[in-house]
């Protein structure tokens, strides 16, 4: 059963992780990029299922993909290069799903703009905060 | 509701410069758009040629990238083509168009009516 | 330079279902967008991001993607559906845009 010191380290981390991603949609949000709509036309692919940490799976296969849409972003309303922002994100969704877990990730027929992706992945870390707290 | 209407001559002689202007009514040029020039050649299909962003930053298609040149100016609400350098080939009907806001799909929402552009001496 | 490949022609009975295709190395990830041409007209959108109906579109009209295919699909073809047909897509990155080169459709 997991231990009070373990869920509240798994609150910060999902709190960290719902940081960054807001971080990134404020990002690109900035209606001052030309950029954003050429972003729009990059297709993310969407978990079928993201209830559980083990469905971060789903999100971190499309990291690599984010990255390269961040990189042709040529913000600079990032604080870390799109590269190091990637990898933080990376180790906090490794640590929350677990690195030994072996779940095959499910994605919908419908893919997404960055941006529902974004949205959709940060609604995920809001909801598994709630049931935390 | 955008609008859009091109204007400039309709014959331009070989080797000389082809020059069209869109007119942006209904909305401002300086939203979160990029503004589009496309041609279509008699009986031929749809071929984009560049864009600009109110900021003046541009993309071009690589094919014609040497020869165009496409400028904004926002004080008039409109934006511009020059094509240098025009054969025959050139001879088409070019259409201005246009994407809606950020936030809604990309693409063109908004088309001109298009101006047919004769390329002959 | 980048290309999206689409059949010239496509002919159907009306009431029947067409089904146009287009082709490109970047729709994995790269959104498709369809224009409707009628003679003498200006194109007008009727599909954006792969799937989804702008609005005034007619439900018969629809899009899926798959791997590097996008497929423009019109249920019950009417003859007002007589038109150009072109997919619309951008590179992988980003900054270049390009349409297929068209398909013409043919309600007999």
């Known amino acids: 059963a997991p231990t009070s010191s373990s869920t509240k380290k798994t609150q910060l981390q999902l709190e960290h992780l719902l940081l960054d991603l807001q971080m990134i949609l404020n990002g690109i949000n900035n209606y001052k990029n030309p950029k954003l709509t050429r972003m729009l036309t990059f297709k993310f692919y969407m978990p079928k299922k993201a209830t559980e940490l083990k469905h971060l799976q789903c999100l971190e296969e499309e990291l690599k993909p984010l990255e390269e849409v961040l990189n042709l972003a040529q913000s600079k309303n990032f604080h870390l290069r799109p590269r190091d922002l990637i990898s933080n994100i990376n180790v906090i969704v490794l640590e929350l799903k677990g690195s030994e877990t072996t779940f095959m990730c499910e994605y919908a027929d419908e893919t997404a703009t960055i941006v529902e992706f974004l949205n959709r992945w940060i609604t995920f870390c809001q909801s598994i905060i709630s049931t935390l707290t | 509701q955008v609008q859009l209407q091109e204007s400039g001559p309709g014959l331009v002689k070989p080797s000389g410069t082809l020059s069209l202007t869109c007119a942006v009514s209904?909305?401002?040029?300086?939203?979160?758009?990029?503004w589009s020039w496309v041609r279509q050649p008699p009986g031929k299909g749809l071929e984009w040629i560049g864009e600009?962003?109110?900021?003046?930053?541009?993309n071009y298609n690589p094919s014609l990238k040497s020869r165009v040149t496409i400028s904004v100016d926002k004080s008039k609400n409109q934006f511009s083509l020059k094509l240098s350098s025009v054969t025959a080939a050139d001879t088409a009907v070019y259409y201005c168009?246009?994407?809606?806001?950020?936030?809604?799909?990309?693409?063109?929402?908004?088309w001109g009516r298009g101006t047919l552009v004769t390329v002959s001496s | 330079s980048y290309e999206l490949t689409q059949p010239p022609s496509v002919s159907v009975s009306p009431g029947q279902t067409a089904r146009i295709t287009c082709s490109g190395d970047?729709?994995?990830?790269?959104?498709a967008y369809w224009y409707q041409q009628k003679s003498g007209q200006a194109p007008v959108m009727v599909i954006y991001?792969?799937?989804k109906r702008p609005p005034g579109i007619p439900e018969r009209f629809s899009g899926s993607s798959s791997g590097t295919m996008a497929t423009l699909t019109i249920t019950g073809a009417q003859v007002e559906d007589e038109a150009d047909y072109y997919c619309y897509s951008t590179d992988s990155g980003g900054d270049v845009s390009v349409f297929g080169g068209g398909t013409k459709l043919t309600v007999l």
């Open positions: 168009a246009s994407g809606t806001e950020v936030g809604a799909p990309h693409g063109f929402d908004y």
């Open positions: 600009i962003y109110h900021s003046g930053s541009t």
């Open positions: 970047a729709l994995p990830r790269k959104f």
């Open positions: 991001e792969d799937s």
């Open positions: 209904g909305g401002s040029i300086s939203s979160s758009n990029w």
